[in-house]
Every structure is written in C-alpha cells, then in structure tokens.
C-alpha cells in the first residue's frame, strides 16, 4: 500500500537569466527511493538520479541543469521558454511510483523583482 505523499515547491517564479531550484520531498513512507526522474512539460527528461548509479543529465540540458541540492535540480540561465510544468517522479521500493508537479513561471527581470517585492509580508 502506498502511504507516502510528495511535497513540492508548488508554483514558483524566477527571473529570466537567473536560476531556480526544483525540489520535491517524499514523506510519510518508509519506502526506499531508488530513482528520481525530472521531466519537463512536454515529457522530455531533464535528468535522472538513480540511488546506485548516480546522476545523468540529458544532453539537451547539460549546459543549464545542475544536479542537486539533494534529489532536486537546479535550472540555470532561465529563458521565457522554460515557463511551464515540471514533474518529479519518485520510483520507490517497494511502494512504487509517486509523482509531484511544479509550475515555473519565468518573468522578465523587472517584473520578477516587482512581484517578489509584493510577496514579502
């Protein structure tokens, strides 16, 4: 029985040209995380973190994706085209597969600074 839940950073925004950390966290299960797949909105794989085999960053993203922190992923040199959904797929043993969703909005620098100011309580 799958008892775990995926917590994600949810909807996030970042500046064009900047970087952002995509992070998911699996909780409420004792299952072992054996692999995490990071996918873009069009189902193309950005990176895989296998518990035993390590990281693989796909060639199309090698220049702009850095592994980590942890099982997360750092997207760099953001462009407007990076706006969209990102999915973390946690393959676990023995539970099976958990999936989380993050929506990233890449904003023009001035807009991002402006919206960030309004988010400060």
């Amino acid at each position: 029985m799958m008892t775990g839940t995926i917590e994600t950073t949810g909807n996030i925004s970042a500046k064009k040209g900047g970087s952002v950390i995509l992070q998911c966290h699996l909780s409420s299960t004792m299952a072992q995380v054996t692999q995490v797949n990071w996918e873009q909105h069009d189902h193309s794989l950005l990176a895989i973190r296998n518990a035993e085999l390590g990281w693989h960053i796909y060639p199309a993203f090698k220049d702009r994706v850095a592994p980590g922190p942890g099982l997360g992923l750092t997207l760099q040199s953001l462009t407007m085209n990076d706006t969209g959904e990102y999915f973390c797929t946690y393959h676990t043993y023995p539970d099976g597969t958990y999936r989380g969703r993050i929506f990233l909005e890449v904003l023009e620098s001035s807009v991002a600074e402006h919206s960030a100011r309004f988010q400060i309580p």
Epitope: T34, Q35, N37, E39, H43, L45, I48, N50, A51, E52, L53, G54, H56, Y58, T89, H91, T92, Y93, P94, G96, T97
Partner: antibody, heavy 125, light 107 residues
Framework: QVQLQESGPGLVKPSETLSLTCTVS??????????LAWIRQPPGKGLEWIGS???????YYNPSLESRVTISVDTSKNQFSLKLSSVTAADTAVYYC?????????????????WGQGTMVTVSS | EIVMTQSPATLSVSPGERATLSCRAS??????LAWYQQKPGQAPRLLIY???TRATGIPARFSGSGSGTEFTLTISSLQSEDFAVYYC?????????FGGGTKVEIK
C-alpha cells in the same frame, strides 16, 4: 566488453534449493556501476525478472518470488549468485544472468544491456 | 506492480513488409521502456531503450515510439533475420516487468 556465463546443476529435485552462479569477465564487479540481475524463462513462455543486486549489496526482488529468493555478490571472485528455495516443477526454466544499467552514466537508461547465454534448469524427481 | 501487455500475440508478415508491435503499460512509465528481440535458443538482445533510442549496432529499420502508457515498435522492412519474439519491458520502478511477447512469423 563484459561477458556473462551462468553455471550450476541442470537438474534439481522438488523442495530442494536451486543454486546458480554467474561469472563476469571483461570487467570488475567491484568497480562496475550497474545492476546484476537474474531473469528466467519457462519453456515456451515469456521472460520473468527474478531480482537484481548492486555491488554494494542492495537487493531488489520480484514480489512473487521474494520469500524464496536470495541473490548475493562475491566481488573477489567477480561472481554473483542466485538461490531459489523450495522449488517445484513450475520453477523449470532457462535462467539468465544479465547486467542492467551499464550505460546509465552515458545515456541515462536502465535496461538489460548484456545477457548470459542462459542455463536450463529442470525441477524433477 | 506495472503490468505490460503486448499485442498481437502473433504477427504474420511477409518479408519486406512493415511490422507494427504494440505494448501497453497499466500506468505511466514515461519513456522508461525497452524492447528486446529473442530468437529460438538464444538470449534476448536489447533493441530499443528510452522508448525510441536504438541500442548500439541495431539497424535503422527498427524504430520505437510512444510515451506514458502506449508504445510501438516498428520494423520498417522485415528481413529474414527479424523473425523472432519481441518483448517490451519497463524500468524503473521495481519490480521490473516484461510484456508477454509478440511472435513475428513468416506469412
């Protein structure tokens, strides 16, 4: 190029333990970044994954066989082995050892890249 | 566990014709799908990984497509050496599971 060779008895009596060994040549298990797997194929039927082990000793088993299966690795001999207890006629099959994930670092996929030629094991009294 | 279902069980095709084999997963496996070819008395060999990428040394007449739950292996022009059984397999997650196979036979 890594090659695999299965060895073990071709005939096992019901209720006994089936024991097979896979010898890896052309590469060292202790430094290899891949899974070592056992897969079987009953006569005239399809493929069934039995289980996999990593060099560190992490094991993963098919839930339908888990209570009867033990996979272990001996890095000093460059071998890994399969033990299947309490066998019945339903365990009669060709048993393959395989390497999974050998190309993960380069290509990002985990699949059974390299296979042994297989060994037929018959369970009969 | 993820159940892999292949269809048809047997496909009768004439040499030189196109063969289309299907594989369906009981839940999404993204593009984590491999195809294997097995000839009588031989071990399977990896044809396609990542749903669509040919393994080393595999001829261009073999192509894979699909994502999620629906996958296809196409052999564009069947050669005599292509008559065999073909299996799909998902990985990850554990347990690894294979489809039941499609036998491609000479019509």
């Amino acid at each position: 190029q890594v090659q695999l060779q299965e060895s073990g008895p071709g005939l096992v009596k019901p209720s006994e333990t089936l024991s097979l060994t896979c010898t890896v040549s052309g590469g060292s298990i202790s430094s290899g970044s891949y899974y070592l797997a056992w897969i079987r194929q009953p006569p005239g039927k399809g493929l069934e994954w039995i289980g996999s082990i990593f060099r560190s000793g992490s094991t993963y088993y098919n839930p339908s066989l888990e209570s009867r299966v033990t996979i272990s690795v001996d890095t000093s001999k460059n071998q890994f082995s399969l033990k299947l207890s309490s066998v019945t006629a339903a365990d009669t099959a060709v048993y393959y050892c395989a390497i999974e994930g050998a190309n993960f670092k380069d290509f990002g996929y985990v699949a059974f890249d390299i296979w042994g030629q297989g060994t037929m094991v018959t369970v009969s009294s | 566990e993820i159940v892999m279902t292949q269809s048809p069980a047997t496909l009768s095709v004439s040499p030189g014709e196109r063969a289309t084999l299907s594989c369906r997963a009981s839940q999404s496996v993204s593009s984590n799908l491999a195809w294997y070819q097995q000839k009588p008395g031989q071990a399977p060999r990896l044809l396609i990984y990542g749903a669509s990428t040919r393994a080393t040394g595999i001829p261009a007449r073999f192509s894979g497509s699909g994502s999620g739950t629906e996958f296809t292996l196409t052999i564009s022009s069947l050669q005599s050496e292509d008559f065999a059984v073909y299996y799909c397999q998902q990985s990850p997650p554990w347990p690894r599971t294979f489809g039941g196979g499609t036998k491609v036979e000479i019509k």
